[in-house]
Amino acid sequence: LRRCLISTDMHHIEESFQEIKRAIQAKDTFPNVTILSTLETLQIIKPLDVCCVTKNLLAFYVDRVFKDHQEPNPKILRKISSIANSFLYMQKTLRQCQEQRQCHCRQEATNATRVIHDNYDQLEVHAAAIKSLGELDVFLAWINKNHEVMFSA
């Protein structure tokens, strides 16, 4: 785990998300359905799988959620773009880690992310994107809990 650090400013991402959270969640047309929120799977991820699950969830947001989401409000769009950009850099940092064979993907890790993709696929694409954005705090909290995130001075 120590060799798989994410060098980015989590505080900045969380701040950006808090500014748009209410507006995003207000657009959620399926409040009783969840994509990440009830995932006990995320809570029982072993330290060995943290890097892989993080990598897969970053890919989920970068390659699916941020591509599927259509945001008409320029102010909110700027914030989402900023979060997406930070995720992209985190993804590249973890890819570097994976290149050095420090990011193993075991079956448990693959299963955990498959559940998220399955949940996403059960909703219409724009509704799924909105819901996943609204649940970003779940992912951010999980990263904070499971990673030694480096806050540079």
Epitope: H12, F66, I80, S152
Partner: antibody
Framework: QVQLVQSGAEVKKPGASVKVSCKAS????????LHWVRQAPGQGLEWMGW????????NYAQKFQGRVTMTRDTSISTAYMELSRLRSDDTAVYYC???????????????WGQGTLVTVSS | AIQLTQSPSSLSASVGDRVTITCRAS??????FGWYQQKPGKAPKLLIY???SLQSGVPSRFSGSGSGTDFTLTISSLQPEDFATYYC?????????FGQGTKVEIK
């Protein structure tokens, strides 16, 4: 309008250090990653690394690891690139460049400084 | 490090010509790729990002295509201001690397 203004040309002796500055204006400095790219005379472009002005986090190309230090001063919206133990083959134009922020996310250097020529000669 | 091989290294063309420059990566880089134009004594200019997205303000005669290992920059109708050196960049893996450049000259 967005501008990246770099410090002036430098002449250094081998073994010395150089610190190039890049002053940003016309946008929120902490909202965009900044990269450093160099170009030796008559040669191609070479990526050196990036700094996240918001956190100060960095990532350097392996080639420059241990010799390069990228820092920033958010109070004056300025990024710095210091290269130590200079050699003659470090003679190049050094550019700072801002990364785009788009959706879906992607990398692209949309604004560049004018370049700083660093000459290393005994 | 991932190597990018541009071809040709130089070409001569006339105004109005259709010009194609290719860049081959030494391994799969998905679409983490861009094209830049540089004129003598000037900083590079972003043309294409994410392999095929046209940067704002860049004329539509420029287009990018490809993914994986093979990428192409096409100028549909070469204009006098397009004579320059073109570089590709991969940002899939650190260290990010540029191609060696393709110089487009007037025939």
């Amino acid at each position: 309008q967005v501008q990246l203004v770099q410090s002036g040309a430098e002449v250094k002796k081998p073994g010395a250090s150089v610190k190039v500055s890049c002053k940003a204006s016309g946008y929120t400095f902490t909202g965009y990653y900044l990269h450093w790219v160099r170009q030796a005379p008559g040669q191609g472009l070479e990526w050196m690394g990036w700094i996240n002005p918001n956190s100060g986090g960095t990532n350097y190309a392996q080639k420059f690891q241990g010799r390069v230090t990228m820092t920033r001063d958010t109070s004056i919206s300025t990024a710095y690139m210091e290269l130590s133990r200079l050699r003659s083959d470090d003679t190049a134009v050094y550019y700072c460049a801002r990364d785009i922020v788009v959706l879906p996310p992607a990398i692209g250097f949309d604004y560049w400084g004018q370049g700083t020529l660093v000459t290393v000669s005994s | 490090a991932i190597q990018l091989t541009q071809s040709p290294s130089s070409l001569s063309a006339s105004v109005g010509d259709r010009v194609t420059i290719t860049c081959r990566a030494s391994q799969d880089i998905r679409s983490d790729f861009g094209w830049y134009q540089q004129k003598p004594g000037k900083a590079p200019k972003l043309l294409i990002y994410a392999a095929s997205s046209l940067q704002s303000g860049v004329p539509s005669r420029f287009s990018g295509s490809g993914s994986g290992t093979d990428f192409t920059l096409t100028i549909s109708s070469l204009q006098p201001e397009d004579f320059a050196t073109y570089y590709c960049l991969q940002d899939y893996n650190y260290p990010w690397t540029f191609g060696q450049g393709t110089k487009v000259e007037i025939k």
